[in-house]
């Protein structure tokens, strides 16, 4: 899958949306590598 910074950001936004925002505080694009997905 796509591992560019923009792809990671959009994937994380989708994950946050689906989880209702209930994730760890440090779960942000610049802390999350593509392996998290």
């Amino acid at each position: 899958s796509c591992n560019t910074a923009t792809c990671v950001t959009h994937r994380l936004a989708g994950l946050l949306s689906r989880s209702g925002g209930v994730v760890k505080d440090n779960f942000v694009p610049t802390n999350v590598g593509s392996e998290a997905f």
Partner: antibody
Framework: EVQLVQSGAEVKKPGASVKVSCKAS????????MNWVRQAPGQRLEWIGD????????NYNQKFKGRATLTVDKSASTAYMELSSLRSEDTAVYYC????????????WGQGTTVTVSS | DIQMTQSPSSLSASVGDRVTITCKAS??????VAWFQQKPGKAPKSLIY???YRYSGVPSRFSGSGSGTDFTLTISSLQPEDFATYYC?????????FGGGTKVEIK
């Protein structure tokens, strides 16, 4: 309110360097990547590179590798793009841009900085 | 680098018209495409990400579709404020690349 405010217009001579700043506010600066894009007069947009303000990791367009340097000052929530060995073809408007998730999911852009390279 | 070829490069249309702009990638970019609107002297404004998702605040008359190599931006009913230049961008691979733009002019 999320804002990206860039430094003012610059006029440089060929061979010189320019450093453009982008001051971020309204969100956590270190949480999101910062992109730099330029647009020469009448031309398409051109991606220069991105920087992770958290660990200062960078990705560059090979076209600018060695001439462009992306840096950040975390304490000032400011990103910088320095371009060296300027030539007339570098005359363009330079933009910073960042896709933010919190507080608002949107792709925010700075207002642009005009860099003119002329002898 | 991935080439993004936009067509047409310009078009003339009237208020209320349906406008379609296409973008073709030189290789598969999945759905990792964005669309931007730019007015003279202004920064680009983001409209669409992931080929078909509108950012909050973007009017519903703007829609995007496509995957792989072929993408489309549609304006269902052109409004006076929509006359501008539109760009596609792929962010599937570094370096990110943009299409050459489509200028939408008043007929």
């Amino acid at each position: 309110e999320v804002q990206l405010v860039q430094s003012g217009a610059e006029v440089k001579k060929p061979g010189a360097s320019v450093k453009v700043s982008c001051k971020a506010s309204g969100y956590t600066f270190t949480d999101y990547y910062m992109n730099w894009v330029r647009q020469a007069p009448g031309q398409r947009l051109e991606w220069i590179g991105d920087i992770n303000p958290n660990n200062v990791g960078t990705n560059y367009n090979q076209k600018f590798k060695g001439r462009a340097t992306l840096t950040v000052d975390k304490s000032a929530s400011t990103a910088y793009m320095e371009l060296s060995s300027l030539r007339s073809e570098d005359t363009a408007v330079y933009y910073c841009a960042s896709i933010i998730i919190v507080p608002n999911y949107f792709d925010y852009w700075g207002q642009g900085t005009t860099v003119t390279v002329s002898s | 680098d991935i080439q993004m070829t936009q067509s047409p490069s310009s078009l003339s249309a009237s208020v209320g018209d349906r406008v379609t702009i296409t973008c073709k990638a030189s290789q598969n970019v999945d759905t990792n495409v964005a669309w931007f609107q730019q007015k003279p002297g202004k920064a680009p404004k983001s409209l669409i990400y992931s080929a078909s998702y509108r950012y909050s605040g973007v009017p519903s008359r703007f829609s995007g579709s496509g995957s792989g190599t072929d993408f489309t931006l549609t304006i269902s009913s052109l409004q006076p404020e929509d006359f501008a230049t539109y760009y596609c961008q792929q962010y599937n691979n570094y370096p990110y690349t943009f299409g050459g733009g489509t200028k939408v002019e008043i007929k």
